[in-house]
């Protein structure tokens, strides 16, 4: 089994181990988001995403998780628990996004819009809330991330 | 292809309320991941962004106007609104309504004239 | 509130290659800031050139094409036709909110 966002194919990645990096800091970071009326990755940011549309968004995603999320997560927090969960997850992801080679012809040009539209509706509600709660709000959303993600592992 | 326009009054008083709404054709404001802006232009000046309403009808506003400025949707019209209140001569502008491409707007109104003025 | 900022003027002869920028006050230009340009005639509304960096809007001539370039946007026009006369603004995604540059005035001569 492997992943299958549409046409970009990672292999090398099993959810089940990136699911048990989250759980081991789940309720830590749930706990500490005193925003639950709003949330980032809404369903209109993941619900109806084509198999082609998919790499695009999940590469986004991904990107803006490694080089905003985790690394500034990083530079705030001291639990080693919690710093080794987060870097499970970042070296899982560094993985994935290493291997999505989203097409730049020309036909797919409305799919990626689209796709980039979806993160930029993601990357506004981050831009909205004050960074250590966007940071924190982003972490308790993983479990949504790799929900979506694991419905393109397939066989 | 998608086509807009604007329409409202085109002269407003100073304190008042400016109320414009932005007819949409050739395309619904809900199909797709489209977001859908407002800007504005004033006399002899260059183009300020105002605000957008994304596809799931959340809001963004620029930080300059965000307490005076309100962008909503009538998706029964296919229309989307602009509300600017206490307006001053300043906000003497043409207004456009557009259809974001990605982030920034992509087919645009063909514009309207407002004037805040006594 | 980011300042976005454009060479005020630029001159181009006909034929030729012009090359405007797009800079952002707080650091560099990236492909995550969505640029974007406008071309605008006098009395007109704007028409949509570029955006998302490079991608060219529909009906746009291949003359006109976006990139970064160092730590600017920039729009690069070649082989400038007298149509091309206008005023150029581009816009970058700052997060949450979008801001235009000031505008730079093209002279085709």
């Known amino acids: 089994q492997e992943f299958h966002f549409g046409p970009c194919q990672v292999k090398g990645v099993v959810p089940q181990k990136l699911w048990e990096a989250f759980w081991a800091v789940k309720d830590t970071m749930q706990a500490q988001d005193n925003i639950t009326s709003a949330r980032l990755l809404q369903q209109e940011v993941l619900q109806n995403v084509s198999d082609a549309e998919s790499c695009y968004l999940v590469h986004t995603l991904l990107e803006f998780y490694l080089k905003t999320v985790f690394k500034n997560y990083h530079n705030r927090t001291v639990e080693v628990r919690t710093l080794k969960s987060f870097s499970t997850l970042a070296n899982n992801f560094v993985l994935i996004v290493s291997q999505l080679q989203p097409s730049q012809e020309n036909e797919m040009f409305s799919i990626r819009d689209s796709a980039h539209r979806r993160f930029l509706l993601f990357r506004r509600a981050f831009k909205q809330l004050d960074v250590e709660a966007a940071l924190t709000k982003a972490l308790g959303e993983v479990d949504i991330l790799l929900t979506w993600m694991q419905k393109f592992y397939k066989l | 292809e998608v086509q807009l326009q604007e329409s409202g009054p085109g002269l407003v008083k100073p304190s008042q309320t400016l109320s414009l709404t932005c007819t949409v054709s050739g395309g619904s404001i809900t199909t797709g991941t489209y977001s859908w802006s407002w800007i504005r232009q004033p006399p002899g000046k260059g183009l300020e962004w105002m605000g957008v309403i994304a596809y799931d009808g959340s809001t963004y506003y620029s930080p300059s106007l965000k307490s005076r400025t309100s962008i909503s949707r009538d998706t029964s019209k296919n229309q989307f609104s602009l509300q600017l209140s206490s307006v001053t001569p300043e906000d003497t502008a043409v207004y456009y309504c557009a259809r974001d491409d990605v982030a920034a707007p992509g087919y645009w109104g063909q514009g309207t004239q407002v004037t805040v003025s006594s | 509130q980011a300042v976005v900022t454009q060479e005020p003027s630029l001159s181009v002869s006909p034929g030729g290659t012009v090359t405007l920028t797009c800079g952002l006050s707080?650091?560099?230009?990236?492909?995550?800031?969505?640029p974007g340009w406008f071309q605008q005639t006098p009395g007109q509304a704007p028409r949509t050139l570029i955006y998302s960096t490079s991608s060219r809007h529909s009906g746009v001539p291949s003359r006109f094409s976006g990139s970064i370039s160092g730590n600017k946007a920039a729009l690069t026009i070649t082989g400038a036709q007298p149509e091309d006369e206008a005023d150029y603004y581009c816009a970058l995604d700052i997060g949450s909110y979008v801001v235009f540059g000031g505008g730079t005035k093209l002279t085709v001569l």
């Open positions: 707080s650091g560099s230009v990236t492909t995550g800031n969505y």
